[in-house]
């Protein structure tokens, strides 16, 4: 066992001479992004104050390619890197095409309405006039491709012109536009060469030791790893913590059960019920508030102030009133909960599926005519699963090195 331990320690660290270095640099696991849209069935009725009715469409599946660049080894046992992602639509794995039309809330209009609720009435009336002039409505009918990667909207230019610096989009607006062909920030992580106990843990993200999106030091902490590998020699008492640039926060997953993936022993880690709980149910989350119902996290502070919320799909594990407020939602543990299966000896993921939902809080706002009589509701826009499983040559090598070899050496 000590020989095995030495081998593991030698080969998991981030070092060009270690066996796992290339695996860390160019993740050989095929990752897929599966996106499910909530097609709004009754937009006109919602504007009259009726309950929203949605139909889940999808999956629209994309192969996700990741590669690290600008890899720089620092002299404090850390390495800095940028990781770029590109997405390629997979028609054969998808239920529909990127040219499918989806009726969705117009995030720019309804988001701006809620953001301006407490602004002077005059400003809201000016926005109403601007929306009318530009032909903007509360709901839009756009293709999957447009929603994902961006569509030209005169409102984007208007926002950039009259509210400069507020908006990260320049010409087009798309929910995943910022992710494609771009990096998720400069990560600086510990290599484990000098101190294995800190391997993969994030030292800094974009040069920051903590973020300032939230209202408490605890919520602003950058904890855990960058979400791809963890320190070796895990136990059932270990937790799986990582910083997610997309959620603008650190997340902690808990051990659920032991299992086996393609002959390799694994630990399954899942989201605790408290992950998106509000501050009154789970006080450490108070820093993420102001909160609505429990089970959804307000990410407006890191998403151009738009009233966007992150949760489990179909409001799984959230306050039941959220799913009850929208017809067509059916939360299901099996289908909608996220998991990561980790090989505990190395801290390397074997099989994972991270599932999250993005929703928009919308309501009627006096002075903004486009919002009609919309009753306040958190309306799901889409949910996605980012999934990957080790396979092929990589799996064979891993199995040989970490399962067969130790068995042979044991005898």
């Amino acid at each position: 066992p000590s020989l095995i331990k030495q081998q593991v320690l030698k080969n998991v660290r981030i070092d060009p001479s270690s066996l796992s270095f290339n695996m860390w640099k160019e993740i050989p696991i095929p990752f897929y992004l599966s996106v499910y849209f909530f097609d709004v069935m009754n937009p006109s009725e919602i504007l009259k104050g009726e309950k929203p009715q949605v139909r889940e469409r999808g999956p629209y599946v994309y192969r996700e390619f990741r590669h690290k660049s600008n890899i720089t080894f620092n002299n404090n046992d850390t390495v800095s890197f940028l990781e770029y992602r590109t997405f390629q639509f997979q028609p054969s794995k998808s239920h529909g095409s990127e040219s499918d039309y989806i009726v969705m809330p117009n995030i720019l209009v309804l988001g701006a309405a809620v953001m301006m609720e407490n602004k002077p009435m005059t400003l809201k009336l000016i926005m109403t006039l601007a929306f009318t002039t530009l032909g903007e409505r509360a709901f839009m009918n756009r293709t999957v491709g447009e929603i994902m990667w961006g569509y030209k909207d005169p409102l984007v230019n208007l926002i950039n012109k009259y509210f400069p610096g507020m908006f990260p989009f320049k010409d087009k607006f798309g929910l995943f536009a910022e992710l494609n062909n771009s990096d998720s920030g400069l990560f600086t992580v510990f290599t484990g060469v000098q101190n294995i106990s800190r391997i993969h843990l994030v030292d800094k993200w974009n040069g920051l030791s903590k973020v300032d999106f939230w209202h408490s030091d605890q919520c602003n902490m950058i904890n855990g790893t960058s979400g791809q590998m963890w320190p070796p020699f895990m136990t059932p008492e270990s937790s799986l913590e990582f910083y997610s640039p997309e959620a603008c926060r650190s997340m902690k997953l808990m051990y659920k059960e032991s299992g086996v993936f393609e002959g390799i022993p694994t630990y399954r880690f899942v989201a605790p019920k408290t992950l998106f709980a509000n501050g009154s149910i789970y006080p450490p989350n108070e820093g993420f508030c102001p909160c609505l119902e429990s089970g959804i996290q307000n990410v407006s502070t890191c998403r151009f102030s738009a009233p966007l919320f992150l949760s489990h799909p179909h409001f799984l594990n959230a306050d039941p009133v959220l799913a009850e407020a929208v017809t067509g939602l059916h939360p299901n543990q099996e289908a909608h909960s996220l998991f990561l299966d980790i090989h505990p000896v190395t801290g390397i993921p074997m099989n994972c599926s991270v599932k999250l939902q993005l929703s928009l809080y919308m309501k009627s706002v006096a002075g903004i005519g486009q919002t009609g009589k919309i009753e306040p509701v958190v309306l799901p826009l889409l949910w996605f699963a980012e999934s990957g499983a080790m396979e092929g040559e990589t799996l064979h090598t891993f199995y040989t090195q970490l399962v067969l070899m130790p068995k042979v050496m044991h005898y």
């Epitope: 602004k119 002077p120 000016i126 006039l129 601007a130 009259y162 509210f163 400069p164």
Partner: antibody, heavy 116, light 110 residues
């Protein structure tokens, strides 16, 4: 060509009501927001309030209790009524068109003197 | 008393560059965009700069605006005699909930 023209009495007695009308030509009054701004002699500009064609108003907090604005879409005019005036209300009163850009078009202004 | 503070006067000789400042707070300039108005003697004000630094058509590019934090400034380069006027900054204010103006700066071309 958009034009705004203020009209109303140039002299108002203290404690009485100041009434002004702004005639809008060259554009429908329903297309924008309309404002009143005043400038006391030798002083800066002071925003009075805005009105939307539907009648929704937004008043300066300091004048709110004495102010009433109205709009008449049939004549393409909007009006201002300021009650219980004092010498401090003596000013040049401008009507203006308000867009996202700001006060984009102005009338030439009308001087209202409050004096007995 | 104006909520936005401007120097009462400024001056320069033809061809010079002059800057006029406008300072406010987080409830106005800090959370809004700034407009600048020019008022030539005996006339109504005219929109000169909107959204901090945008010029309406017809305004010469000698006029430029900028904003940083809770302050804004108007710069006039290549000063000309016809630039002699009063200049006012304006912004939305969230606390009194309306439009506020600066006290105005009288620009003299020497």
């Amino acid at each position: 060509q958009l034009q705004l023209q203020e009209s109303g009495p140039g002299l108002v007695r203290p404690s009485e009501t100041l009434s002004l009308t702004c005639n809008v030509s060259g554009v429908s009054i329903s297309d924008d927001l309309w404002s009143w701004i005043r400038q006391s002699p030798g002083k800066g500009l002071e925003w009075i309030g805005n009105i939307y064609y539907s009648g929704i108003t937004d008043y300066s907090p300091s004048l709110k209790s004495r102010l009433r604005m109205s709009v008449d879409t049939s004549t393409n005019q909007f009006s201002l009524r300021l009650s219980s005036v004092t010498a401090a209300d003596t000013a040049v009163y401008f009507c203006a068109r308000l867009t996202l850009r700001g006060f984009q078009n102005w009338g030439q202004g009308t001087l209202v003197t409050v004096s007995s | 008393q104006s909520v936005l503070t401007q120097p009462p006067s400024a001056s320069g000789t033809p061809g010079q560059r002059v800057t006029i400042s406008c300072s406010g707070s987080s409830s106005n300039i800090g959370s809004s965009t700034v407009n600048w108005y020019q008022q030539l003697p005996g006339t109504a004000p005219k929109l000169l700069i909107y959204s901090n630094n945008q010029r309406p058509s017809g305004v010469p590019d000698r006029f430029s605006g900028s904003k940083s934090g809770t302050s804004a400034s108007l710069a006039i380069s290549g000063l000309q005699s016809e630039d002699e006027a009063d200049y006012f900054c304006a912004a939305w204010d969230d606390s009194p909930n309306g439009v506020i103006f600066g006290g105005g700066t009288k620009l003299t071309v020497l």
